[in-house]
């Protein structure tokens, strides 16, 4: 039974506007038509789900309307963007990929991307 490898960058620095993007790539052992991608955040051994999307190969990823994630897919590659991040959201963001259909089912978990978020300094008052 083949394994499914999931690759993601080790470190990403969020922009000053609290946006972080990274690629989650999976080596598909089969010809999946339905794929589920989940992003989890691990901090201090606590794991929480950040967002999840199921998509049909060749179609766009659709996250829930209130999700902080957006993404696009191209082949076995998913480009993920997480927005609204603050310094307290710094942590390890894990990409989990599931090949839902057709059988057999496959699951792969990436090593995680450490996202660093630095809150911008407030603008000093200017005296004119």
């Amino acid at each position: 039974c083949k394994a499914m490898h999931v690759a993601q960058p080790a470190v990403v620095l969020a922009s000053s506007r609290g946006i972080a993007s990274f690629v989650c790539e999976y080596a598909s052992p089969g010809k999946a038509t339905e794929v589920r991608v989940t992003v989890l955040r691990q901090a201090d051994s606590q794991v929480t789900e950040v967002c999840a999307a199921t998509y049909m190969m060749g179609n766009e990823l659709t996250f829930l309307d209130d999700s902080i994630c957006t993404g696009t897919s191209s082949g076995n590659q998913v480009n993920l963007t997480i927005q609204g991040l603050r310094a307290m959201d710094t942590g390890l963001y894990i990409c989990k990929v599931e090949l839902m259909y057709p059988p057999p089912y496959y699951l792969g978990i990436g090593n995680g991307t450490q996202i660093y978020v630095i809150d911008p300094e407030p603008c000093p008052d200017s005296d004119f």
Epitope: A3, H5, V6, L40, Q42, S45, V47, T48, E49, I94, L107, G108, I109, G110, N111, G112
Partner: nanobody, 115 residues
Framework: EVQLVESGGGLVEPGGSLRLSCAAS????????MGWYRQAPGQQRDLVAH???????MYADSAKGRFTISRDNAKKTVYLQMNSLKPEDTAVYYC?????????WGQRTQVTVSS
């Protein structure tokens, strides 16, 4: 090195119950998924159920209603309670562990449902 040790298989009559256990040894990531696959003679290896360290559970259709997966994170052990067993549940059952960037298989445990 991570190792998985399974137990609890055996011969049971139709309608009976079995509880499979799988214990992981070695260092594993705090986020992980443990689960069970099964392979009947001449068939492919299929997922039965899995459970993540944060409690998220997934069941295959064939397992819903009769099988219950649970885990003890402190013991790094996953359990599969199988009730109302049928002859078609006869298979080799494999434990699987997914950790960050890797996965591992257990050896195997035979489950035979027969009168």
């Amino acid at each position: 090195e991570v190792q998985l040790v399974e137990s609890g298989g055996g011969l049971v009559e139709p309608g009976g119950s079995l509880r499979l256990s799988c214990a992981a040894s070695g260092s594993i990531s705090s986020y992980n998924v443990m689960g069970w696959y099964r392979q009947a003679p001449g068939q492919q290896r299929d997922l039965v159920a899995h459970i993540a360290s944060n409690g998220e559970i997934m069941y295959a259709d064939s397992a819903k209603g009769r099988f219950t997966i649970s885990r003890d994170n402190a013991k790094k052990t996953v359990y599969l309670q199988m009730n109302s067993l049928k002859p078609e549940d006869t298979a080799v059952y494999y434990c699987k562990l997914w950790v960050l960037g890797n996965d591992y298989w257990g050896q195997r445990t035979q489950v035979t449902v027969s009168s």
